[in-house]
Amino acid sequence: SPVPFGPEGRLEDKLHKPKATQTEVKPSVRFNLRTSKDPEHEGCYLSVGHSQPLEDCSFNMTAKTFFIIHGWTMSGIFENWLHKLVSALHTREKDANVVVVDWLPLAHQLYTDAVNNTRVVGHSIARMLDWLQEKDDFSLGNVHLIGYSLGAHVAGYAGNFVKGTVGRITGLDPAGPMFEGADIHKRLSPDDADFVDVLHTYTRSFGLSIGIQMPVGHIDIYPNGGDFQPGCGLNDVLGSIAYGTITEVVKCEHERAVHLFVDSLVNQDKPSFAFQCTDSNRFKKGICLSCRKNRCNNIGYNAKKMRKKRNSKMYLKTRAGMPFKVYHYQLKVHMFSYNNSGDTQPTLYITLYGSNADSQNLPLEIVEKIELNATNTFLVYTEEDLGDLLKMRLTWEGVAHSWYNLWNEFRNYLSQPSNPSRELYIRRIRVKSGETQRKVTFCTQDPTKSSISPGQELWFHKCQDGWKMKNKTSPFVNLA
């Protein structure tokens, strides 16, 4: 097989019971109703056909019911993220039922075997939901399945098998191996619930992608492009590696989806927003910061249901830790050059000055290449709320700061010895805030002084001729 993982067990080989359950007395799938935020507290175990625990543990039939579904495990015990998620759900939805689906005996196996067990676990959850539906006042519409990694596909199977339609499934970095390109009924898909939202935090185009790359929900959110998560770089986890756990690097990015979801529960006042875009590169260019026609949404728990959309890819940048929210800005910069600047790409930085705060010196990331005598779009983001933008400073990093630029400068000189100087003319910069959707145009103070060269800076202020400002009220007022 040309794919890293071979196929799961054949259809005709599939048993009514997975191998691991044959000799066990303890059921291989248990439903633990968490009655306390305290992870040490045992909670109540629910089982189909036994109504007493529902009464004993005050299961609220009219409230929301969350099912948390873990994924493949190497340790065989619950990881810390699960307790944090339980606690966050209890904090946010005080009356809700929070049920932990414990399928550790079936998940603590070879990955391929754990994958083979996802169907039977999904079926067990569906049977539990079918039984609960027989009770007065219980509604499938109030059920929210939250699955992490392999657990996301378990949630998909549960939604698939249940009689009726589950209200919502959230996939937290659904597993990639053996699910990438799988049939619609063999993985999490938009058909599995009334609303399926997905966070992808560990996708890789090259090498093994721990998380699934393809969109599998109504909305699929790719924080930081869905791959390299801030705070999860080698440098950030070197301490972990020193203690012999290189898996911490993988875990950090894969588990980031859970922490983003927890963040959305506990930091309601700092909601993160994602923007619809066809791909990560276009987002990095700053092209996709529109909120028109439902093109933006809250991420995590606060995501707004968009059933008309299917497999809608959305992107955002985040901080390295909680709260993850950042403020996105689109910069449209028209760059004009009277002389040919050759292949050299200017290394530009912008500093934004606002009514609340000022930004750091932010690099203008060149995704492909800067087009001269054209409008270039950039994405920048800040960790703090700057308030209303007042002015901005554009700097062109001096040649000496960059070996790459130094080499390009030398090469340019060799090819064009008569005209080695580089100069760009930038008269105005149009800025759009992703979070408020406000647009402001900034102009150079002196229209005659709009040129910039390496090592120089250029200041921009709000244009005198009536700077543009649209959508004065934030579209997110009703989303938060």
């Epitope: 599939k14 009689k163 990438e180 063999k186």
Partner: antibody, heavy 116, light 107 residues
Framework: QVQLQQSGAELMKPGASVKISCKAT????????IAWVKQRPGHGLEWIGE????????KYNKKFKGKATFTADTSSNTAYMQLSSLTSEDSAVYYC?????????WGQGTSVTVSS | DIVMTQSHKFMSTSVGDRVSITCKAS??????VAWYQQKPGQSPKLLIY???YRFTGVPDRFTGSGAGTEFTFTINSVQAEDLAVYYC?????????FGGGTKLEIK
């Protein structure tokens, strides 16, 4: 092993209805989707829709909504497709197929001929 | 609906040759594509799923590749028994859609 046994050929009058059966053996019938596929002579394959027997959930191709109706009987491990208001356009071979990786296993097909 | 297009309705080849059949999707279907073989008078058979996985019991002369919108099905050394119509199908979203089929003829 997995087998899908379909009912025999049918010769029907225009305007009539026909019900085709597909009996499954060799796997857990209730938890795998069964699809129905149409193939007209000299034409390609056309997905009509599918049913999950355990929950009676169905998915239909818009083109066949109102034309095809799926049901399933889990006690006999049999899936059914009823075609109504038959016209000559409905003359075709109809296949049932069980879905896992793709349409893994197919029935032998049921020929339906609509003629006055 | 996603349209799957097989540009060649017929392809002619000789025993022992290598032949490739292409299929194009009208939108991104990632790697969610299956290939089926239908021999004259028989039901279709699944050969390849998820673009490149061989189904149980399928000889290794049959391979699949591609991602996104362009997919290729290859028979590395054509045998006489490979005379059939080959169909691609996307299994990324409902409604599932098939390509028009490519009839492989043996010279």
């Amino acid at each position: 092993q997995v087998q899908l046994q379909q009912s025999g050929a049918e010769l029907m009058k225009p305007g009539a209805s026909v019900k085709i059966s597909c009996k499954a053996t060799g796997y857990t019938f209730s938890t795998y989707w069964i699809a129905w596929v149409k193939q007209r002579p000299g034409h390609g394959l056309e997905w009509i829709g599918e049913i999950l027997p355990g929950s009676a959930k169905t998915k239909y191709n818009k083109k066949f909504k109102g034309k095809a109706t799926f049901t399933a009987d889990t006690s006999s491990n049999t899936a059914y497709m009823q075609l109504s208001s038959l016209t000559s356009e409905d003359s075709a071979v109809y296949y049932c197929a069980v879905y896992d990786y793709g349409a893994d296993y197919w029935g032998q097909g049921t020929s339906v001929t609509v003629s006055s | 609906d996603i349209v799957m297009t097989q540009s060649h309705k017929f392809m002619s080849t000789s025993v022992g040759d290598r032949v490739s059949i292409t299929c194009k999707a009208s939108q991104d279907v990632y790697t969610a594509v299956a290939w089926y073989q239908q021999k004259p008078g028989q039901s279709p058979k699944l050969l390849i799923y998820s673009a490149s996985y061989r189904f149980t019991g399928v000889p290794d002369r049959f391979t699949g590749s591609g991602a996104g919108t362009e997919f290729t099905f290859t028979i590395n050394s054509v045998q006489a028994e490979d005379l059939a119509v080959y169909y691609c199908q996307q299994h990324y979203s409902i409604p599932r859609t098939f390509g028009g089929g490519t009839k492989l003829e043996i010279k």
